[in-house]
Amino acid sequence: CDLPQTHSLGNRRALILLAQMGRISHFSCLKDRYDFGFPQEVFDGNQFQKAQAISAFHEMIQQTFNLFSTKDSSAAWDETLLDKFYIELFQQLNDLEACVTQEVGVEEIALMNEDSILAVRKYFQRITLYLMGKKYSPCAWEVVRAEIMRSFSFSTNLQKGLRRKD
């Protein structure tokens, strides 16, 4: 499955919006830094693992959407930027949905995807528990925003690589 060029542009727009959403200096939150253990191995790999990576990226965007859709998130960010961010994520989910649907029913891909989907889910569980532990403080949200930016950047580069291999 080939992702449309617009998908990559949407990804970049989402990254720009995430950057714009920053309200406080990252340096003032250094004490709150945390290693969430981004499951990079899920997104690495060869062409055979392309379906796995796309499926995992869909899960990542879906979990990001859910994370930023909570009432705690709404209180933390600028409403206009947040709404624009939702739109970009929604569009990306639509693009990826078509790709993942094509692979549904392929047995070896399904087995591979179990672990990759669970790895992404666990990553977001760590983020969720971190935010709760920090009582959704402004610095906690800033750390999470920066983390999501890093993971999006990584997967954007991955998708460029996948397109080149095609």
Epitope: S55, F65, N66, V104, A110, F124, Q125, T128, L129, M132
Partner: antibody
Framework: QVQLQQPGAELVKPGASVKLSCKAS????????MHWVKQRPGQGLEWIGE????????IYNENFKSKATLTVDKSSITAFMQLSSLTSEDSAVYFC????????????WGQGTLVTVSA | QIVLTQSPAIMSASPGEKVTLTCSAG???????LYWYQQKPGSSPKLWIY???NLASGVPARFSGSGSGTSYSLTISSMEAEDAASYFC?????????FGSGTKLEIK
């Protein structure tokens, strides 16, 4: 508020199939995986599998792969589970439960459908 | 698959008594993915404790959870009549997700 509606009961004959439904409301249906869980009378809970309503990807417990088929209908925001070649061992209450994270994992359950397999 | 063994299968406690239910995993489970559910007859399970030690919304403070690796527990500091129910531990650390066989807690 989040709600998952399931019919109360289904009576089916041995060897037949049954399709159970779980109608969602109060949240964006396509954003959360839907899980199915089996409970035999007076017994524990068994995880059957899950489906992502967004793209239809399914993940099954190997023990139920030849028994259950999970599907969704996005237009009616409903998840389905078809159980085939029914025997008395399949008589149980079947719950749907919504995925999530942290305090949202399996925080929402349907009331359950009692399936009775009897001639 | 990870087998979760709960003990005892049935127990009864007097009001005010301290109660501890245990859940033993066949292989190690990350504490972030160990949950407890309460179920009363004729009802669906309710999320009770998530990630080993966090109480779900509305759960009384007399409940607590602890553990790591293969050994987990749910404790009630002072039993009350409304606590009579079945309690199931659950893991989603690895596929297939599994539940314990449950402990039925009765009031004396």
């Amino acid at each position: 508020q989040v709600q998952l509606q399931q019919p109360g009961a289904e009576l089916v004959k041995p060897g037949a199939s049954v399709k159970l439904s779980c109608k969602a409301s109060g949240y964006t249906f396509t954003n959360y995986w839907m899980h199915w869980v089996k409970q035999r009378p007076g017994q524990g809970l068994e995880w059957i599998g899950e489906i992502n309503p967004s793209h239809g990807r399914t993940i099954y417990n190997e023990n139920f792969k030849s028994k259950a088929t999970l599907t969704v209908d996005k237009s009616s925001i409903t998840a389905f589970m078809q159980l085939s070649s029914l025997t008395s061992e399949d008589s149980a209450v079947y719950f749907c439960a919504r995925g999530g994270l942290g305090p949202a994992w399996f925080a929402y359950w349907g009331q359950g459908t009692l399936v009775t397999v009897s001639a | 698959q990870i087998v979760l063994t709960q003990s005892p299968a049935i127990m009864s406690a007097s009001p005010g008594e301290k109660v501890t239910l245990t859940c033993s995993a066949g292989s190690s489970v990350d504490s972030s993915y160990l949950y407890w559910y309460q179920q009363k007859p004729g009802s669906s399970p309710k999320l009770w404790i998530y990630s080993t030690s966090n109480l779900a919304s509305g759960v009384p403070a007399r409940f607590s959870g602890s553990g790591s690796g293969t050994s987990y527990s749910l404790t009630i500091s002072s039993m009350e009549a409304e606590d009579a129910a079945s309690y199931f531990c659950h893991q989603w650390s690895s596929y297939p997700f599994t539940f314990g066989s449950g402990t039925k807690l009765e009031i004396k």
